[in-house]
């Protein structure tokens, strides 16, 4: 009795089993290792990659696909041959029996044979349909890989043209260096002449200094008299101040000016004359709400408000939406200033964003965006960036156009997965995208092949977790 079964074996290949009489035929149709069937929830053309697959890898995969196609064809041919052989044997048997049996019996056998043939043909059609499905799927994957290959070829061409441009630039710079060397020799000669003239001047000045030293001795005597007078004056002033403070404490002149001043950002702190790195109190725009932030008053002219810092893994960055909204951590160490403050600040005027990165090999790089702002909470603090320059990659590692902010309890990314839960930390995830500076902190020698680390893809690749990061903002017109 004919019978047909489809199942999966232990290693995931599809099995097609045909039962005919006492014989059963099992066809193992191979599937490519790294491909999945369309019934799988993982749809290959929806997969987000940080970068296209290597060209060689694609070629290799195409060859594997061709081999599978060949195998399938061979299986079909074998199947057809077998059925033909089987038919021949049965026909011979029928002919031998026909001499001894009556016509009625022959007709019955003929009918049975026709039924069996029809059944087998139907089963064969089913198998062919299955193989055809498999072949169609493989063709689709083949097409996808060829698209990926085209993309790679285009990228290679782009890179080649860029290399050519760089070579042109290089030769131009070499010429410039040579010209500068010539200039340098001429300058050295003139410097030598100036040096001789200066030596003459120095000797003249030495004699003048000797005379001045004599005059200083006389002035010192007078100075001590002045110092005593100044001391007496200071005492009088202090007494007056004490008298004033007891009579009217509210108008006390010793109260520092700083008390009446509020600063919106570190640029304002800097402009008020406080040019030392440190923690300062800032006030929200159009409000009395306050927050403390670290101000970098040295890097690139100073006045930078630090909105994020990672340096040692001491602070957990897998936080809630509210914590990312209001800020967490300590401004002297690892911290997130808070999306609400940054959003309000960057919507008041135009700000630039600088992201400073350090790897574990002692290298540093930065990305500078000439215009940065965050949307309001209603729009999930969506990031807006324009005009990238810097050394941490020519392509923005924060996906463009900007994405909404996502946290473990606020999933606003473009992935069916939850990027924040999967990669840890709150960030402007795409699906999930080429960066996450709020990922897990991994120490040295444990920082590679980490999908959930502190990532800036276009500088260090997808699996590299950075040593330190700082995000800072400053008004564009500073």
């Amino acid at each position: 009795y004919n019978n047909f079964r489809k199942s999966m074996d232990s290693i995931g290949k599809k099995q097609y089993q045909v039962q005919h009489g006492s014989c059963s035929y099992t066809f193992l149709l191979p599937e490519m290792d790294n491909c999945r069937s369309s019934s799988s929830p993982y749809v290959s053309n929806a997969v987000q990659r940080d970068a296209p697959l290597e060209y060689d890898d694609s070629v290799q995969r195409l060859q594997v696909l061709e081999n599978i196609m060949e195998n399938n064809t061979q299986w079909l041919m074998k199947l057809e041959n077998y059925i033909q052989d089987n038919m021949k044997k049965e026909m011979v048997e029928i002919q031998q029996n026909a001499v001894q049996n009556q016509t009625a019996v022959m007709i019955e056998i003929g009918t049975n044979l026709l039924n069996q043939t029809a059944e087998q043909t139907r089963k064969l059609t089913d198998v062919e349909a299955q193989v055809l499905n498999q072949t169609t799927r493989l063709e689709l994957q083949l097409l996808e890989h060829s698209l990926s290959t085209n993309k790679l070829e285009k990228q290679i061409l782009d890179q080649t043209s860029e290399i050519n441009k760089l070579q042109d630039k290089n030769s131009f710079l070499e010429k410039k260096v040579l010209a500068m060397e010539d200039k340098h020799i001429i300058q050295l000669q003139s410097i030598k002449e100036e040096k001789d003239q200066l030596q003459v001047l120095v000797s003249k000045q030495n004699s003048i200094i000797e005379e001045l030293e004599k005059k200083i001795v006389t002035a010192t005597v007078n100075n001590s008299v002045l110092q005593k007078q100044q001391h007496d004056l200071m005492e009088t002033v202090n007494n007056l101040l004490t008298m004033m403070s007891t009579s009217n404490s509210a108008k006390d002149p010793t109260v520092a000016k700083e008390e009446q001043i509020s600063f919106r950002d570190c640029a304002e702190v800097f402009k008020s004359g406080h040019t030392t790195n440190g923690i300062y109190t800032l006030t929200f725009p159009n409000s009395t709400e306050e927050i403390k932030a670290y101000c970098d008053m040295e890097a690139g002219g100073g006045g930078w408000t630090i909105i994020q810092r990672r340096e040692d893994g001491s602070v957990d960055f897998q936080r809630t939406w509210k914590e990312y909204k209001v800020g967490f951590g300590n401004p002297s160490g690892e911290y997130w200033l808070g999306n609400e403050f940054v959003s309000q600040l960057t919507n008041q005027q135009r700000y630039v964003l600088k992201i400073h990165l350090k790897d574990w090999e002692g290298n540093e790089a930065y990305s500078l965006y000439e215009h940065f702002y965050l949307s309001s909470e209603e729009l999930n603090y969506r990031i807006h960036l324009k005009g990238l320059t810097g050394t941490a990659g020519k392509i923005s590692s924060i996906s463009q156009p900007g994405n909404d902010f996502s946290t473990k309890d606020g999933d606003n990314d473009k992935c069916i997965c939850k990027c924040s839960q999967m990669l840890t930390g709150g960030w402007w995830f795409d699906a999930c995208g080429p960066s996450n500076l709020n990922g897990m902190y991994y120490p040295q020698r444990q920082n590679t092949n980490k999908f959930n680390g502190i990532k800036w893809y276009y500088w260090k690749g997808s699996g590299y977790s950075l040593k330190a990061t700082t995000m800072m903002i400053r008004p564009a017109d500073f």
């Epitope: 700083e258 440190g278 923690i279 109190t281 403390k292 002297s332």
Partner: antibody
Framework: EVQLVESGGGLVKPGGSLKLSCAAS????????MYWVRQTPEKRLEWVAT????????YYPDSVKGRFTISRDNAKNNLYLQMSSLKSEDTAMYYC????????????WGQGTLVTVSA | DIVMTQSHKFMSTSVGDRVSITCKAS??????VAWYQQKPGQSPKLLIY???TRHTGVPDRFTGSGSGTDYTLTISSVQAEDLALYYC?????????FGSGTKLEIK
């Protein structure tokens, strides 16, 4: 373990002066704003003074402005409160406190030092 | 200055009861409210900040809630050791101001 230990309290006459100290340990003192908070005999809590990490910014309520001065010595991990022209309403338990970092909620408090202003 | 008002000076409760202590700010403080517990002879201890975030080591029977100007500290099942003074404080702006305190008494 974070520790804040106040000292310098005592009995003083109205118009007199007193200097309170707070010795900090168990954390990087120069990384945090520091505060003085007092508790009146009626158990009311009142903020008295704030000083920034470097000491360049100081803040006071109007009730003590001009009479009290907050200062710090980051090398010695010490916080100070110089009180002058003391009044009877300054009688209180004075606590030295440290915040969490970004905002002024007080995570750590000292055991307090009692200041009594009485004739 | 922002004024924080705790309308109940005293609250009497029994062990196992649920109790809610309220606090009202004179203006919207955007959930920038902290709660402290002060037991007799001790310094105040931080329980809650940002209106609802429990400080490390604080038992989960203590919960904070509220927004705008109205805030509440709730003890779901009062224990004998919860006998104390409870203060609210706004950490929205300078000066940081405290409520006058609510004394929780055990019947």
């Amino acid at each position: 373990e974070v520790q804040l230990v106040e000292s310098g309290g005592g009995l003083v006459k109205p118009g007199g002066s007193l200097k309170l100290s707070c010795a900090a340990s168990g954390f990087t003192f120069s990384d945090y704003y520091m505060y003085w908070v007092r508790q009146t005999p009626e158990k009311r809590l009142e903020w008295v003074a704030t000083i920034s990490v470097g000491g360049s910014f100081t803040y006071y309520p109007d009730s003590v402005k001009g009479r009290f001065t907050i200062s710090r010595d980051n090398a010695k991990n010490n916080l100070y409160l110089q009180m002058s022209s003391l009044k009877s309403e300054d009688t209180a338990m004075y606590y030295c406190a440290r915040d969490w970092g970004l905002r002024p909620w007080f995570v750590y408090w000292g055991q307090g030092t009692l200041v009594t202003v009485s004739a | 200055d922002i004024v924080m008002t705790q309308s109940h000076k005293f609250m009497s409760t029994s062990v196992g009861d649920r109790v809610s202590i309220t606090c009202k700010a004179s203006q919207d403080v955007s959930t920038a409210v902290a709660w402290y517990q002060q037991k007799p002879g001790q310094s105040p201890k931080l329980l809650i900040y940002w209106a609802s975030t429990r400080h490390t080591g604080v038992p989960d029977r203590f919960t904070g809630s509220g927004s705008g100007t109205d805030y509440t500290l709730t003890i779901s099942s009062v224990q004998a050791e919860d006998l104390a003074l409870y203060y609210c404080q706004q950490h929205y702006s300078t000066p940081p101001t405290f409520g006058s305190g609510t004394k929780l008494e055990i019947k």
